[in-house]
Each structure stands twice: as structure tokens, then as C-alpha cells.
């Protein structure tokens, strides 16, 4: 058994406040 290092959350989907790139004016899917 090996300890697995912590990993981050999934990459934020478009529309999420932490999604990469500019936020579109139109809604997009996160959650």
C-alpha cells in the first residue's frame, strides 16, 4: 500500500467562477 498524494478538484467547467479563460456572457454548464 502506498500513500496517494492529495489531488485537486476536477478542472472547473465553463461558467464556474474558477473556470480557465474568460467567462462567457451566455450561460454554460457547471455543476
Amino acid at each position: 500500500w502506498q500513500h496517494q498524494p492529495d489531488s485537486g478538484p476536477p478542472a472547473a467547467a465553463p461558467g464556474h467562477p474558477l473556470a480557465p479563460g474568460p467567462h462567457p456572457a451566455a450561460p454554460s454548464s457547471w455543476g
Epitope: D6, S7, G8, P9, P10, G15, W30, G31
Partner: antibody, heavy 120, light 107 residues
């Protein structure tokens, strides 16, 4: 059981700062984003900000940017929000809320809430 | 920001009654809507996500639906523990925004 336990109520003077905590348990802290919400007395909810506990990335509501600071302590699975230059408008209950950024676990677990009263 | 208009703001109903709460979105949110329940002690619990999917442990008397830009939460037969505040939340676009809430009271 997944839980978000928040620090107790605080009374602060106008112009002061407050730092509240949110201790996560029952899940991998770094695997979910942590959001903060505001609920003024008798009113609806408002999203303030979010942090990625894994790398410290943050995003803020335009309304609060510059006054709210989010941080985490990964070793204790605790998220913090500091609010500066407080006014009576900041008197509210503040909730931490987790989300995974994409899937069904979006705002699925809410903290117990921290009541902040700003009064001289 | 997307505006969520929730109605009614308050509602008095009797045990066993069927009630519906509605939220209207100012823009298309593509079913990215949740319903939250807040008890008098401040505890908040998510009931529904993606417009109509019930969270685990939520009683089947709760249901969610959509008609155009109107999203509804229906409680088929009210029980005493259902008297609380309810909020809708859109998460299609940043920032996430909430409806103004509905206070559900016992008649």
C-alpha cells in the same frame, strides 16, 4: 459523514476585520472547491468567493473583491475567510459550501454558518 | 449576472396539502438549477440539483420540474418538517445567483 464546521459568532466594530474558519471532515479537503456565501438578516443568499484548496486559486464576486481574502490550511483541512473594513452592511450569517466544479456535488454540503455582527 | 425571480415570497399551507414554488431565470440556465431548504436554526440542505434530481435521503414527496424559463419545486403532501425557507440557485453562469426565497408556513 461529510461536515463543514464553522467558527462561532463574532461581534466587531465598524472598520475592523474578521477572520472566520470552516473545518472540513469526512472527505478529501483538497478535492473540492470551497465557496463562501452571505445571508443578511431575513434576506436571500449571495455568493462571495471561491477557493481551490489544492493550489490556492481564488475567484471573487466583484462586489467583495479587495475586501474578502480566502485562504486554506491543508494540514488541518480548514478554509478561512477574512473580511476587512467592516460596516453594518456586513452584519450577516456567512456559510462555507463545497463544490466539485463540474459534477453533481455542486453546493451539496453547507457549513453551520458564522454570525457576524458589526456594531459600535 | 443572471437574475432569479422566486415566487411566492411566502406561503401558508396545511399539512397534507400540495404546494409549488417557482423560480424564473432572466437568461437560459439549461437546467442548471438547485433547490435548497433552510430550517429555522439556519441549517441549509440541498434538496434537488439539475432541476429535477433528488439528493440522496430527500423524501419522494419533493420533485422539481421546468417549463421554459420557469423552474418549480413541488411538495406533494406537506409534512411538519417541510415548513421552512426555500431558495432556488442557478449555477449555469458565474456568479452563481439565488432566488429571493419562499417562506413556507403552517396555516
Amino acid at each position: 459523514e461529510v461536515q463543514l464546521r464553522q467558527s462561532g459568532p463574532v461581534l466587531v466594530k465598524p472598520g475592523a476585520s474578521v477572520k472566520m474558519s470552516c473545518k472540513a471532515s469526512g472527505y478529501t479537503f483538497t478535492g473540492y472547491y470551497m465557496n463562501w456565501m452571505k445571508q443578511s438578516h431575513g434576506k436571500s443568499l449571495e455568493w462571495l468567493a471561491v477557493i481551490n484548496p489544492y493550489n490556492g486559486d481564488t475567484a471573487y464576486n466583484r462586489k467583495f473583491k479587495g475586501r474578502a481574502i480566502l485562504t486554506v490550511d491543508k494540514s488541518s483541512s480548514t478554509a478561512y475567510m477574512e473580511l476587512n473594513s467592516l460596516t453594518s452592511e456586513d452584519s450577516a450569517v456567512y456559510y462555507c459550501v463545497r463544490d466539485d466544479g463540474y459534477h453533481v456535488r455542486f453546493f451539496d454540503v453547507w457549513g453551520t454558518g458564522t454570525t457576524v455582527t458589526v456594531s459600535s | 449576472d443572471i437574475q432569479m425571480t422566486q415566487s411566492p415570497s411566502s406561503l401558508s399551507a396545511s399539512l397534507g396539502e400540495r404546494v409549488s414554488l417557482t423560480c424564473r431565470s432572466s437568461q437560459d440556465i439549461s437546467d442548471y438549477l438547485s433547490w435548497l431548504q433552510q430550517k429555522p436554526d439556519g441549517t441549509i440542505k440541498r434538496l434537488i440539483y439539475s432541476t429535477s434530481t433528488l439528493d440522496s435521503g430527500v423524501p419522494k414527496r419533493f420533485s422539481g420540474s421546468r417549463s421554459g424559463s420557469d423552474y418549480s419545486l413541488t411538495i406533494s403532501s406537506l409534512e411538519s418538517e417541510d415548513f421552512a425557507d426555500y431558495y432556488c440557485l442557478q449555477y449555469a453562469s458565474s456568479p452563481p445567483t439565488f432566488g429571493g426565497g419562499t417562506k413556507l408556513e403552517i396555516k
